[in-house]
């Protein structure tokens, strides 16, 4: 009699022990998924602000007419700072017009002072012709001053006013661009 | 986890044309910028060409006015067309997907299997 009483205590316990599992099982999970809520709120609300005040560019980005530009504040080689560039859903600096670049220059000065900037021009090392990296040629008067003499790849570069060139793999800043978000006001 | 399927490699002969496409599992709106890469043997994987999610286009240096990319947003697809082929375009180009950020994580780039292009006569 008593062993059958001892049994039944024991099966009572690990009843009890398995409940008090479920229940810290419970609250971990009711605790995750208050937390996955928050996160889920913080989110949402988040996006619908971004979406309200719906700024052009992001932050620390510059605008100017159609387009938005960050200027790094690291050094990296041409390569890299295209694919930095590429990360943030832009592309390197794509100088369109003399208005465009007194802008870029006019900012920097303000920003930074003179230093050198990397922007999307290279030259291709068979014709020795200049391209933008989206395929498309400099206007006239937005070509490199000065020609490498570098027997490497050869990159486009701002600083101060002037477009200069150099070899691919030298360090600089660079200068990220892409399109400003437009109203939908 | 996003997959991203490329297709449209083989052996063409210097001068010709290929067209690559890379079928991506996720719409390209969550993604920053998709594009191509490749890696030759013995070489470091370099940047081909990659379009951002706002319509911007980069070229690598060597390939730049040889080399076009496209999209097709309907069918969540990026296409390389690559002409006038040297043997020095021969290596393995990837597809590659940059995320973008949701609420401050950072998440690596998908990168795809990689499709061989080999240019020779």
């Known amino acids: 009699k008593l062993l059958q009483v001892s049994t039944i205590a024991m099966q009572q316990q690990e009843k009890l022990i398995q409940q008090e599992r479920a229940l810290l099982n419970f609250t971990e999970w009711k605790r995750s998924c208050a937390l996955q809520m928050k996160y889920c709120q913080a989110f949402m609300q988040n996006s619908l602000s971004s979406a309200h005040n719906s700024s052009p560019c992001p932050n620390n980005w510059i605008q100017n007419r159609e387009s938005c530009y960050y200027v790094s504040e690291i050094w990296s080689i041409w390569h890299t700072s295209q694919e930095n560039c590429l990360k943030e859903g832009s592309t390197l600096l794509q100088i369109e017009s003399k208005e465009e670049m007194d802008f870029i220059t006019g900012s920097l000065r303000k920003i930074k002072g003179s230093y050198d900037y990397w922007v999307g021009l290279s030259q291709d090392g068979h014709s020795g012709r200049w391209l933008w990296q989206d395929g498309s040629s400099p206007s006239p008067g937005l070509l490199p001053a000065e020609r490498s003499q570098s027997a490497n790849q050869v990159c486009g570069y701002v600083k101060s006013n002037s477009l200069l060139s150099s070899n691919c793999s030298t360090w600089k800043y660079f200068i990220c661009e892409k399109y400003a978000l437009r109203s939908s006001v | 986890q996003v997959q991203l399927q490329e297709s449209g490699g083989g052996l063409v002969q210097p001068g010709g044309s290929l067209r690559l496409s890379c079928l991506a599992s996720?719409?390209?709106?969550?993604?920053?910028?998709m594009g191509w890469y490749r890696q030759a043997p013995g070489k470091e994987r370099e940047l081909v060409a990659a379009?951002?999610?706002?319509?911007?286009?980069a070229y690598g240096i060597a390939v730049n006015g040889r080399f076009t990319i496209s999209r097709d947003n309907a069918k969540n697809t990026v296409y390389l067309q690559m002409n006038s082929l040297k043997p020095e375009d021969t290596a393995v180009y990837y597809c590659?997907?940059?995320?973008?950020?949701?609420?401050?994580?950072?998440?690596?780039?998908?990168w795809g299997q990689g499709t061989q292009v080999t240019v020779s006569s």
């Open positions: 590659n997907a940059k995320p973008t950020p949701v609420y401050g994580s950072t998440v690596g780039d998908y």
């Open positions: 996720r719409s390209f709106s969550s993604f920053n910028a």
């Open positions: 379009i951002t999610n706002g319509g911007r286009i």
